[in-house]
Interface confidence: low
């Protein structure tokens, strides 16, 4: 058993049929010595008396808010949550496996630049009695500070018969060094509590591996005289790290016909302009990627040829 | 060419070669960035390789003030990785093809380190640990780890030379 926060405790249980459970001793936070009784949740049934209460925690029915009283007065509370371990693996019932980039990916994180700011998000089908708490650090043996905000509900989607809820959090490394080569990964820890079930989820990454620039901005076409060619130009996204002579991007320019089956023409360039042939009813799209490290491409910025 | 305490390197040549290094490092193992090879002891093991750290003067301001600190750090790293790529980890079984990107990467690391330090000038270099993994899975694991770490190192080096070529070239 360990303390999650004041008066909230997590009991770790091996979860299998006829498991013996864990013996837990609760102590009433009071100078009083006698006349103390214990109850669980809203029940008035007295579970025991005395300053301490010993219970065998085996299932969710044994978890909840234990309260010690004297006379009609509440002296203190202890909320017991359960953390299930099945076949040696901690349960992951609360969050949905996003399966990207690999199985057992519950947390996904992205950064728009090298400033040390990043966003993580996760999915669940649970709509009520759900709380999240997020902590982060750079490295784990001698952790350096990363400050995370509160997790908020950022999107709701309907998936078949189910509703899916997306939560996200923004974090910022306290002393980020954008130009340095990271040697210690960022660790993100999410505590999730649904009713009386506790679970924790972690993700470990380097900012460089989660970089995804915003799409290029100000995408414009300039027709070239007496030609089907056009000059496409664009600019670095505002959110990208500066100076651009140091934090450089590379770009992919694509000409795509109306039909998905039509052959796509692609040009790769380090410049912020390119000359392409504009076909009728086609569109021109440009996306960006870090020039020197193969992290994710940005989403496409597009304009129609006409 | 960068000489200890001396003149500027051939920024444009260094830029071209460092950008080539980036391409080669990713073609040597394109999956490296997406492989989950971070074990328990990874924090310790990453410290075996030289990293370009915050105080090494490789940021735009540091390069403007005095690029020598940063160039020396990059040189150390290039020599270190060049030795690693020439070691038993990469030369032993499972053997790589003679024209593999690793062979080209090895040659390019050497080329860039020589651009930075001509014969006769010696910056201190970091000791390379003596490595003799004996099993294929060990070698594969170490190759992945080294290449992934090299990808990060050459990305920073390439940024330095790109910025130098754009702003510090005579």
């Amino acid at each position: 058993i360990w303390e999650l926060k004041k008066d909230v405790y997590v009991v770790e249980l091996d979860w299998y049929p006829d498991a013996p459970g864990e013996m837990v001793v609760l102590t009433c936070d009071t100078p009083e010595e006698d006349g103390i009784t214990w109850t669980l949740d809203q029940s008035s049934e007295v579970l025991g008396s005395g300053k301490t209460l010993t219970i065998q925690v085996k299932e969710f029915g044994d978890a909840g808010q234990y309260t010690c009283h004297k006379g009609g007065e509440v002296l203190s509370h202890s909320l017991l949550l359960l953390h299930k371990k099945e076949d040696g693996i901690w349960s992951t019932d609360i969050l949905k496996d996003q399966k990207e980039p690999k199985n057992k990916t519950f947390l996904r994180c992205e950064a728009k630049n090298y400033s040390g700011r990043f966003t993580c998000w996760w999915l669940t089908t649970i709509s009520t009695d759900l709380t999240f708490s997020v902590k982060s650090s750079r490295g784990s043996s001698d952790p350096q500070g990363v400050t995370c905000g509160a997790a908020t509900l950022s999107a709701e989607r309907v998936r078949g018969d189910n509703k899916e809820y997306e939560y996200s959090v923004e974090c910022q490394e306290d002393s980020a060094c954008p130009a340095a080569e990271e040697s210690l990964p960022i660790e993100v820890m999410v505590d999730a509590v649904h009713k009386l079930k506790y679970e924790n989820y972690t993700s470990s990454f380097f900012i460089r591996d989660i970089i995804k620039p915003d799409p290029p901005k100000n995408l414009q076409l300039k027709p070239l005289k007496n030609s089907r060619q056009v000059e496409v130009s664009w600019e670095y996204p505002d959110t990208w790290s500066t100076p651009h002579s140091y934090f450089s991007l590379t770009f992919c320019v694509q000409v795509q016909g109306k039909s998905k089956r039509e052959k796509k023409d692609r040009v790769f360039t380090d410049k912020t302009s390119a000359t392409v042939i504009c076909r009728k009813n086609a569109s021109i799209s440009v996306r960006a990627q870090d020039r020197y490290y193969s992290s994710s491409w940005s989403e496409w910025a597009s304009v129609p040829c006409s | 060419r960068a000489v200890p305490g001396g003149s500027s390197p051939a920024w444009t040549q260094c830029q071209q070669l460092s950008q080539k290094l980036c391409t080669l490092a990713w073609s040597a193992h394109p999956l490296v960035g997406h492989m989950d090879l971070r074990e328990e002891g990874d924090e310790e093991t990453t410290n075996d390789v030289p990293h370009i750290q915050c105080g090494d003067g490789c940021d735009p301001q540091g390069l403007r003030d005095n690029s020598q600190f940063c160039l020396q750090r990059i040189h150390q790293g290039l020599i270190f990785y060049e030795k690693l790529l020439g070691s038993d980890i990469f030369t032993g079984e499972p053997s790589l093809l003679p024209d593999s990107p690793v062979a080209q990467l090895h040659a390019s690391l050497l080329g860039l380190s020589q651009l930075l330090q001509p014969e006769g000038h010696h910056w201190e270099t970091q000791q390379i640990p003596s490595l003799s993994p004996s099993q294929p899975w060990q070698r594969l694991l170490l190759r992945f780890k080294i290449l992934r770490s090299l990808q990060a190192f050459v990305a920073v080096a390439a940024r330095v030379f790109a910025h130098g070529a754009a702003t510090l070239s005579p």
Partner: antibody, heavy 117, light 108 residues
Framework: QVQLVQSGAEVKKPGSSVKVSCKAS????????ISWVRQAPGQGLEWMGG????????NYAQKFQGRVTITADESTSTAYMELSSLRSEDTAVYYC??????????WGQGTLVTVSS | DIVLTQSPATLSLSPGERATLSCRAS???????LAWYQQKPGQAPRLLIY???SRATGVPARFSGSGSGTDFTLTISSLEPEDFAVYYC?????????FGQGTKVEIK
């Protein structure tokens, strides 16, 4: 001539953990990998994972990921395999073996781990 | 992971006969890093062949290994009484090394 000597038999309760040791003598320990292989009664050999003591790199079979921890202490030339959340199916003989370029050439005598309530 | 399938599961032969054991891999074994082990009841396995065809130190010449890619064979040219045991193949050419399920060579 390298020899690997393992710790003695263990009887464990379901849900508990077991830690088996494997001490090398008569040769260099650090440069080789030590692999752990188990064999359930009447069954075949199953590789669990291995470690290169010199680097501390451990590599685990997918099946045991999260439940097994392999460590090595170079100062005593000893490798350890800890398996947690034991269940009856983990009853087996656990072997350590020196894992060299030519397969597993030296094996420990085996440690029987019995999981029973 | 590479799956190794050994056949037959049991081989019933008499002393002096030739034994041919097969090991098939679900995908090509990198560098032909395939080993064969012999195991007798109550004993640890013993390395016989490594690298598909090289005999380990002290292994009699009647044991030979062959094959490459996905098909490998262990041959015992003339069975001696002490050769009746279980034989396992083992690929160690990938990050996750695997064993076959074993072939039992028993006295007919």
């Amino acid at each position: 001539q390298v020899q690997l000597v393992q710790s003695g038999a263990e009887v464990k309760k379901p849900g508990s953990s077991v830690k088996v040791s494997c001490k090398a003598s008569g040769g260099t320990f650090s440069n080789y990998a030590i692999s752990w292989v188990r064999q359930a009664p009447g069954q075949g050999l199953e590789w669990m994972g291995g470690i290169i003591p010199m680097f501390g790199y451990a590599n685990y079979a997918q099946k045991f990921q999260g439940r097994v921890t392999i460590t090595a202490d170079e100062s005593t030339s000893t490798a350890y395999m800890e398996l947690s959340s034991l269940r009856s199916e983990d009853t087996a003989v656990y072997y350590c073996a020196r894992d060299i370029y030519a397969g597993m050439d030296v094996w420990g005598q085996g440690t029987l781990v019995t999981v029973s309530s | 992971d590479i799956v190794l399938t050994q056949s037959p599961a049991t081989l019933s032969l008499s002393p002096g006969e030739r034994a041919t054991l097969s090991c098939r891999a679900s995908q090509s074994v990198l560098g032909n890093y395939l080993a064969w082990y012999q195991q007798k009841p109550g004993q640890a396995p013993r390395l016989l062949i490594y690298g598909a065809s090289s005999r380990a130190t002290g292994v009699p010449a009647r044991f030979s290994g062959s094959g490459s890619g996905t098909d490998f064979t262990l041959t015992i040219s003339s069975l001696e009484p002490e050769d009746f045991a279980v034989y396992y193949c083992h690929q160690y050419g990938s990050i996750s090394t695997t064993f076959g399920q074993g072939t039992k060579v028993e006295i007919k």
